[in-house]
Each structure stands twice: as structure tokens, then as C-alpha cells.
């Protein structure tokens, strides 16, 4: 059907309580665009009856609540004057209670669901609330360890809980539950965020230091094979993740079909007061798409890019 | 809607004196820290001081400690900054600024000039 | 004292142009790094906080990376209110520093 296929992360979501994703993919969608939703290669598109537990609105699909049985593949099909792209996002429904246990055996949860407190600075939390402008959010109420957050040094800001003075106490498991009202009908969001603490930054802390790259462009020839080290320095102790993405996604999970691009095995050297991480990405083949998109190093809350460019014509072989 | 409105400012000899004042309305005040930042005539921003949101913690640059106090007034919604022993380097436009976590400036008044000159 | 040194200067740019602008701290200051706008005659204006935050009602095509010593600021796709000055601050340790500004020309 002429439709390039691109793959997006999974999505891991709580069941029982609203979802949404909008299918977004710049520059693609800054455009004159249709999109049209399916779920797992159907040939009917997702209903846009607003009725409907699950339908587009606009350029989202929007689950209301979410079931379990709603786990699978969905496809937005983008199309432009002369492009069409389609848009795999898998999502990935669990049954979870967030006072029954920790959300830390979940697999590959989000950065959203894990963030990070500085020890003694005032900083804050964020309630992830991604819904299209027909769902009305009402006030957000934070909750730690299943209690209720109340206290001098903690103020609810918007869709932030800010936290002063920050101690090796805020610690721990956190929600956020805020009332979303849809169609005169009201539901209940709540979002589990497993809180850590780092110190300061060097390698007392477990901020991660890019070495290379420095956010920079690199000259190379189309078709040609093409090997970039990210090179991190960590703390002996860290459990900072150090992975490429591109558009926000694993590049092993958005070079799924052609593994044109992929990700090298990670290796580090040992240092007596942190360690060097390397992890590589490899172009088996470098292609007139992959220039100007920014490929992203990330180490935790670092990140550095590289830009792929065609190198500039040589007119002295003319 | 968040309104911070400075005043106090004005032309001063060097070696003078002036207490610039802040009044914030639409936010809880007490909750949160403030700060006065400059800016000189060469456009340069500068850092001048924070006050923590219960009183208790005040920091400056080594530029203006022992000149300047910071303090704020809960009750009354109000912010100062008293400047005293001013010299030329202290020309600048001062803002005062909501600060939401560390060096989180999200909103600021629309500032008010000192001038210091003989 | 933390000196932050911002690049370039000034940089001219066409409408839609993808911009980047630099601070680099003389010493590692974590994440803690704000960027500003101010256009001329205006207040500094909030952009990003905490090295890659967006505040509240920024347009997305504004973004912030690095931590550390190293810190990015891009604009993708120019628009022509963004024609103005940048600022970024750290906040890591006292006295807080900014950096001397980035000021954008249309080419």
C-alpha cells in the first residue's frame, strides 16, 4: 500500500483507568495530514464515535478506561499530499494496584514512572498527563507510600509536586490521581512514580557524564558503513540505563524490520573512582533519511547527539 | 494570575542607600523562594540574592554580601531587597523573581531601575 | 565561582533553520541549568528548567539537553518571535552564574 512502516517503544499502562497516545511524528505531522487509527492490521479503523470505549479524537486514540484485553499492536496511518507513513506503537496493559507492592519489578518502565530527587535542592515531580483537549484534567492529588502528601516543604504546582529541601527520606514510591471528565462521564487517573535520590553532581552522585558525543554533526557518504561510540562515565554504583534512540525510540525498536541501524553490546572499563561506559551504533548502510535526524546517546538523565551530513562537494576533483 | 510588582528604585549617590520592595499577588507567596536579579546596561543578567519560602535561609554572591539584606514579609505578600553603601556597579535594572524549584525563575516582575551616580 | 561560558554570541539564522546554542560550565553542575528568552524591552521569560524541562506553555520545538559540564539549547523550525536573546543560569552552587547570552539575527 505504498505506507513506510516505523516502530515506536512500548507502551506499558495500567489497566482500569484512561489512556491516551496521539499520533505525532514530526516533521511528518506538522503538515496537511489525515490519520486514521487501527488495532492489530485491521482493515476498520478505530470508531470516532465519542461514545465508544475506545476512539480517535482528532489524532488521538483514546481508551476510556483501559482493559486488559486492549494489550496488542495499533497502527496510525499518516497521510500526506504524496506520503504516507504508518505508525506501529505497542501497548502493553497490566493489572496493577499501587499499594499493593513496588512498581519497581515492572519491566522497562518509562522515565515517566522513575524520576529523580537532588538531595537538599528544591526541586520537583511530574504528574504525566497526556490527554487530546476534549478530556477536562481536574486539580492533581499527590500520594506517597499510599498517604495522602501533605507538609511545609511540599506544594502541588500544576501537574508538579515540588519538593524543598530535598532528603534522602522522599524517597520511595509516589502517585499521582487526578479526575479526568469526558463526555459528562468522570474517571479516575492514577500514575505510579518510583522516586530515587542522587547527591550532587560528579561521581558522588549518579549524574552520568557524556564524553563523546558533544552534540555535533558528522560528514559521511551515502551508502557507506558507519560506527559511533557513546562513551559515558558513571559511578561505580550506578543503575543508569545507556542506550541510542532516534525519535524518541530505541533504535533497535525503530530499525525492527530492516536492522539497518542497530545498537552495539555495551562494554566498560573500570576506573578506581567510576567506571567508562562505551555502547556503539552501527549504519550498515547510511541513507538520504538518516541525515539532519538527530541519533541520541542517552545514560540516564544525560544525552548527546550525533547529526549525520552529506559532506560538502570537493570542486577541485571537477 | 501571578503579579510581581517591584518599586523603590531610583537615583542614588554612591555610598547611598535604597530598600526596593516586591509585592506578589495570585500565588501563594509564603510558599515559595524568591530572588532579586539584575540586569546592567550592558545586558548582562547577574544573580543578587534568594530568600528560602519560610525565612529561614538567605544567599548572595561575594558582589553584594554585607551590602545587601534580603527579607520577606509572609503576612503581607512582600519581598525586599535593602542595598545600602551602593557603588557605580550596582546600576542595573532589579527584578525580583518566584522561584518553583532551584533556579526555577517562572515568574518576574517587570522590574525597577537604580541609578548610581554622583 | 562557577563561570558559564555561552556560545556563540550572536548567530544569524533563516526562518525554519534548526539553531543551537551552547553553556558550558567551568565545573560540573549536574543538571541544574535554566535557559531564558528575553526580547528586547521585555522581562526574562522562563523557558527550560533542570537541563531539559520544558516550562509550562513553551512550544515543543524549544528543547534542552546535557548535564554536567556540557548543556544544548535548540529551537527547531525558527519562527520569528524566537528572533531574540538566550540566557542560561546554574543553579548547582552558590553564586549562581549566567552565561553572558546569545542574542539571534535573521540572516
Known amino acids: 500500500d505504498g505506507c513506510k512502516d516505523i516502530f515506536m517503544k512500548n507502551e506499558i499502562l495500567s489497566a482500569s483507568q484512561p489512556f491516551a497516545f496521539n499520533c505525532t511524528f514530526p516533521p511528518i505531522t506538522s503538515g496537511e495530514v489525515s490519520v486514521t487509527w487501527y488495532k492489530n492490521s485491521s482493515k476498520i479503523p478505530v470508531s470516532k464515535i465519542i461514545q465508544s470505549r475506545i476512539h480517535q479524537d482528532e489524532t488521538w486514540i483514546l481508551f476510556l478506561p483501559m482493559e486488559w484485553g486492549d494489550s496488542g499492536v495499533y497502527q496510525c496511518v499518516i497521510k500526506g499530499r504524496d506520503s504516507c507513513h504508518r505508525i506501529h506503537v505497542n501497548l502493553t496493559v497490566f493489572e496493577k494496584h499501587w499499594c499493593d507492592t513496588s512498581i519497581g519489578g515492572l519491566p522497562n518502565l518509562s522515565d515517566e514512572y522513575k524520576q529523580i530527587l537532588h538531595l537538599g535542592k528544591d526541586d520537583s515531580l511530574t504528574c504525566h498527563l497526556h490527554f487530546p483537549k476534549s478530556c477536562v484534567l481536574g486539580p492533581i492529588k499527590w500520594y506517597k507510600d499510599c498517604n495522602e502528601i501533605k507538609g511545609e516543604r511540599f506544594t502541588v504546582l500544576e501537574t508538579r509536586l515540588l519538593v524543598s529541601n530535598v532528603s534522602a527520606e522522599d524517597r520511595g514510591n509516589y502517585a499521582c490521581q487526578a479526575i479526568l471528565t469526558h463526555s459528562g462521564k468522570q474517571y479516575e487517573v492514577l500514575n505510579g512514580i518510583t522516586v530515587s535520590i542522587t547527591e550532587r553532581a560528579g561521581y558522588g552522585g549518579s549524574v552520568p557524564k557524556i564524553i563523546y558525543p558533544k552534540n555535533h554533526s558528522i560528514e559521511v557518504q551515502l551508502g557507506t558503513t558507519l560506527i559511533v561510540d557513546c562513551n559515558v562515565t558513571d559511578t561505580k554504583d550506578n543503575t543508569n540505563l545507556r542506550c541510542w534512540r532516534v525519535n524518541n525510540t530505541l533504535v533497535d525498536d525503530y530499525y525492527d524490520e530492516s536492522k539497518r541501524i542497530r545498537e552495539g553490546v555495551e562494554t566498560h572499563v573500570s576506573f578506581r573512582e567510576h567506571n567508562l561506559y562505551t555502547v556503539n551504533i552501527t549504519f550498515l548502510e547510511v541513507k538520504m533519511e538518516d541525515y539532519g535526524l538527530p541519533f541520541m546517546c542517552h545514560a540516564g538523565v544525560s544525552t548527546a547527539y550525533i547529526i549525520l551530513q552529506l559532506p560538502a562537494p570537493d570542486f577541485r576533483a571537477y | 494570575e501571578v503579579m510581581l510588582v517591584e518599586s523603590g528604585g531610583g537615583l542614588v549617590k554612591p555610598g547611598g542607600s535604597l530598600k526596593l520592595s516586591c509585592a506578589a499577588s495570585g500565588i501563594t507567596f509564603s510558599r515559595f523562594a524568591m530572588s532579586w536579579i539584575r540586569q546592567t546596561p550592558e545586558k548582562r543578567l547577574e544573580w543578587v540574592a534568594t530568600?528560602?519560602?519560610?525565612?529561614?535561609?538567605?544567599y548572595y554572591p561575594d558582589s553584594v554580601k554585607g551590602r545587601f539584606t534580603i527579607s520577606r514579609d509572609n503576612a503581607n505578600n512582600t519581598l525586599y531587597l535593602q542595598m545600602r553603601s551602593l557603588r557605580s556597579e550596582d546600576t542595573a535594572m532589579y527584578y525580583c523573581a518566584i522561584m518553583i524549584t532551584t533556579g526555577e525563575h517562572a515568574y518576574w516582575g517587570q522590574g525597577t531601575l537604580v541609578t548610581v551616580s554622583a | 565561582e562557577i563561570k558559564m561560558t555561552q556560545s556563540p554570541s550572536s548567530l544569524s539564522a533563516s526562518l525554519g533553520d534548526t539553531i543551537t546554542i551552547t553553556c558550558r560550565a567551568s565545573?560540573?553542575?549536574?543538571?541544574?541549568l535554566t535557559w531564558y528568552q528575553q526580547k528586547p524591552g521585555n522581562i526574562p521569560k522562563l523557558l527550560i528548567y533542570k537541563a531539559s524541562n520544558l516550562h509550562t506553555g513553551v512550544p515543543p520545538r524549544f528543547s534542552g539537553s546535557g548535564s554536567g559540564t556540557d548543556f544544548t539549547f535548540t529551537i527547531s523550525s525558527l519562527q520569528p518571535e524566537d528572533i531574540t536573546t538566550y540566557y542560561c543560569?546554574?543553579?548547582?552552587?552558590?553564586?549562581?552564574?549566567f552565561g553572558g547570552g546569545t542574542k539571534l539575527e535573521i540572516k
Open positions: 543560569l546554574q543553579s548547582q552552587s552558590y553564586p549562581w552564574t
Open positions: 565545573q560540573d553542575i549536574s543538571v541544574w
Open positions: 530568600i528560602s519560602s519560610g525565612d529561614m535561609y538567605t
